[in-house]
């Protein structure tokens, strides 16, 4: 019969390694995106990052982040996003709800969307790593 699997006990060092990898990849993405000159960040787009009512790593809004990055991948062929998505999937529960993103249609606005979300993603991964390491320190004290 089709039984649900035993809940996976994942060591914290694995989670930290995933987030460290995401942090590194987010910097690569941002560096790539910033090569486009004359594009300014927009106040119109906000990437969900950390949820205050959950413990790390479940406090990372991984499904929403995945949806935003998937949108960037469709707008601009950044292959680093493929690897980012694979790592985000390690943090996403298989029954997590889908997130719908409204995509800008104007070419320049698309570039602003890509830059803004890439910048926010990079900052988000810095925060996520901080929240993981501070959480780990609290757990040991």
């Amino acid at each position: 019969s089709h039984t649900l699997p035993v809940r996976l006990l994942r060591p914290s060092d694995d989670v930290q390694k995933i987030v460290e990898e995401l942090q590194s990849l987010s910097k690569m993405l941002l560096k790539d995106v910033e090569e486009e000159k004359g594009v300014l960040v927009s106040q119109n787009y906000t990437l969900p990052c950390l949820s205050p009512d959950a413990q790390p790593p479940n406090n990372i809004h991984s499904p929403a982040i995945r949806a935003y990055l998937k949108t960037i991948r469709q707008l601009d062929n950044k292959s680093v996003i493929d690897e980012i998505i694979e790592h985000l999937d390690k943090l996403i529960f298989q029954d997590a709800p889908e997130t719908n993103i409204s995509v800008p249609t104007d070419t320049h606005e698309c570039k602003r969307f890509i830059l803004t979300i890439s910048q926010q993603f990079s900052e988000c991964m810095d925060l996520a790593l901080k929240s993981l390491t501070s959480g780990a320190q609290q757990a040991t004290t």
Epitope: P5, D13, I85, D89, I92, F93, D95
Partner: antibody, heavy 122, light 107 residues
Framework: QVQLVQSGAEVKKPGSSVKVSCKAS????????MQWVRQAPGQGLEWMGA????????RYSQKFKGRVTITADKSTSTAYMELSSLRSEDTAVYYC???????????????WGQGTTVTVSS | AIQMTQSPSSLSASVGDRVTITCRAS??????LAWYQQKPGKVPKLLIY???TSAEGVPSRFSGSRSGTDYTLTISSLQPEDVATYYC?????????FGGGTKVEIK
Amino acid sequence: QVQLVQSGAEVKKPGSSVKVSCKASGYTRTRYWMQWVRQAPGQGLEWMGAIYPGEGDTRYSQKFKGRVTITADKSTSTAYMELSSLRSEDTAVYYCAFPEGQYAAPYGMHYWGQGTTVTVSS
Amino acid sequence: AIQMTQSPSSLSASVGDRVTITCRASRNIGNYLAWYQQKPGKVPKLLIYYAKTSAEGVPSRFSGSRSGTDYTLTISSLQPEDVATYYCQHFWKTPWTFGGGTKVEIK
């Protein structure tokens, strides 16, 4: 009960294409990656590629890039692997495999199709 | 691509022997490693996932462990029905490559 049923054996001429199907039943996951693997006679398992059926997102082994296309039809819970420009070295058993678990990313492939034998011969 | 180096490529042991098979990853892949058993003419069967978690219905004599980038599949007491080829596969990032396989035979 999860079942993966693959299409039947194929005999193909060099230079032609083959399309193998893999139909899943009893599988309730929404976010997952499934993979295609092949095994030439007397050889080991070789990873060909993967698909995230919900979005049609694909990943391919560098070895097969440009020759393999993996697709999925969500409405029929069927995945497909098409291999073109066939040569004799492509004679193998082709498998589809699906994961189980609580995350979207796999950490093992729990369910396997029965395999599809593809023979390439002139 | 991450390389998985599996050793030995074949081994012969007596019934009741303790058997160990190793896979070494070319870089850190965390616990994202699975072990499969494939009997002649059969479909691969998942034994261990996430480096050390046993799949449902797998006999307790099979276990997995990890030390850094080295992963070990242990059969604590080899049985005649364990004659098969064993493969490791990583899931850190695509391509999800396999080890070359270890053929286990009974002496």
